[in-house]
């Protein structure tokens, strides 16, 4: 039975040209995390595998950094980075947990006033 829950940074905004940390946290389960995938709607960004370590998609190698922890840092943000991001926790014995983050990349002056809030 899957008892865990994923907490995410929810809906976030960031400045064009800046960087942002995508972070998820799995709680309320004793399941072992064996792999975490970071995904966009149509492609994989990165994998953190307990045995194999990090794999960063070549399309993102120049501006994606692993961490902190199981999170992902996106750098040199562009407006095209706006959209959904998913963390997928592969666990044993529970199975797969999914968290969703929506990132909006704004022009510098707008981002300063951008609200940050968490989706439960």
């Amino acid at each position: 039975m899957m008892t865990g829950t994923i907490e995410t940074t929810g809906n976030i905004s960031a400045e064009k040209g800046g960087s942002i940390i995508l972070q998820c946290h799995l709680s309320s389960t004793t399941a072992q995390v064996t792999q975490v995938n970071w995904e966009q709607q149509d492609q994989l960004l990165a994998i953190c595998n307990a045995d194999l370590g990090w794999h960063i998609s070549p399309s993102f190698k120049d501006r994606v950094a692993p961490g902190p922890g199981l999170g992902l840092t996106l750098q040199s943000l562009t407006v095209n980075d706006t959209g959904e991001y998913f963390c997928i926790y592969h666990t044993y014995p529970d199975g797969t947990y999914t968290g969703r983050i929506f990132l909006e990349v704004l022009e510098s002056s707008v981002a300063e006033h951008g609200a940050r809030f968490q989706i439960p």
Epitope: Q35, N37, E39, Q41, D42, I47
Partner: antibody
Framework: DVQLQESGPGLVKPSQTVFLTCTVT??????????WSWIRQFPGNKLEWIGY???????TYNPSLTSRTTITRDTPKNQFFLEMNSLTAEDTATYYC???????????WGQGTTLTVSS | DIVMTQSHKFMSPSVGDRVSITCRAS??????VAWYQQKPGQSPKLLFY???YRYTGVPDRFTGGGSGTDFTFTISSVQAEDLAVYYC?????????FGGGTKVEIK
């Protein structure tokens, strides 16, 4: 339980357009994070992904088929559709609809509908 | 597009045999490979995702593994009901692409 069921005309003539329907039960096609895909399987068993409509309504096609395909949906009826034009004999295949997860894998499939393009 | 190659089109094990089906990706896909089973007259069924993660209800005699470009799907002790075509699929990027399939026929 999630179920998908395809329906279509079965036989169409070359150069014509076909309209296939996928009826989904057990889950709303607007349920977050899922994509609703069309996949075809040619007589030699080869599988080809055609495209999907996302829960939010955005649509993505296989670039090799973009010019000939249109995917739409009817959310009140919980159906999504594939329209393919300029058909040739090479489009003869079994057409499946499937649910696609965030990981881009297909966890539920319909039984398939056979399309034969022949004069 | 990422090309997925299954080098063996057919395999003919006896009941109880161990069978390994291989799949090669044309570029590094990390662990983003899924495996499907298609029995005669049926639609494909998901068996594994992320190379080694067993989908719900899949028997323990099936295992998946690999990373990078080389992936393996293994049946530790083939049963008569395992007669099917097995496909790999990369779920790394779009368009999603499948291998050509490996047909397992029981001797």
């Amino acid at each position: 339980d999630v179920q998908l069921q395809e329906s279509g005309p079965g036989l169409v003539k070359p150069s014509q357009t076909v309209f296939l329907t996928c009826t989904v039960t057990g889950i709303s096609i607007t349920t977050g994070n899922y994509k609703w895909s069309w996949i075809r399987q040619f007589p030699g068993n080869k599988l080809e992904w055609i495209g999907y409509i996302y829960y939010s309504g955005t649509i993505t096609y296989n670039p090799s088929l973009t010019s000939r395909t249109t995917i739409t949906r009817d959310t009140p009826k919980n159906q999504f559709f594939l329209e393919m034009n300029s058909l040739t004999a090479e489009d003869t295949a079994t057409y499946y609809c499937a649910r696609e997860t965030v990981l881009r894998v297909f966890d539920y499939w319909g039984q398939g509908t056979t399309l034969t393009v022949s004069s | 597009d990422i090309v997925m190659t299954q080098s063996h089109k057919f395999m003919s094990p006896s009941v109880g045999d161990r069978v390994s089906i291989t799949c090669r990706a044309s570029q590094d896909v990390g662990t983003a490979v899924a495996w499907y089973q298609q029995k005669p007259g049926q639609s494909p069924k998901l068996l594994f995702y992320s190379a080694s993660y067993r989908y719900t209800g899949v028997p323990d005699r099936f295992t998946g593994g690999g990373s990078g470009t080389d992936f393996t799907f293994t049946i530790s002790s083939v049963q008569a009901e395992d007669l099917a075509v097995y496909y790999c699929q990369q779920h790394y990027s779009s368009p999603r692409t499948f291998g050509g399939g490996t047909k397992v026929e029981i001797k």
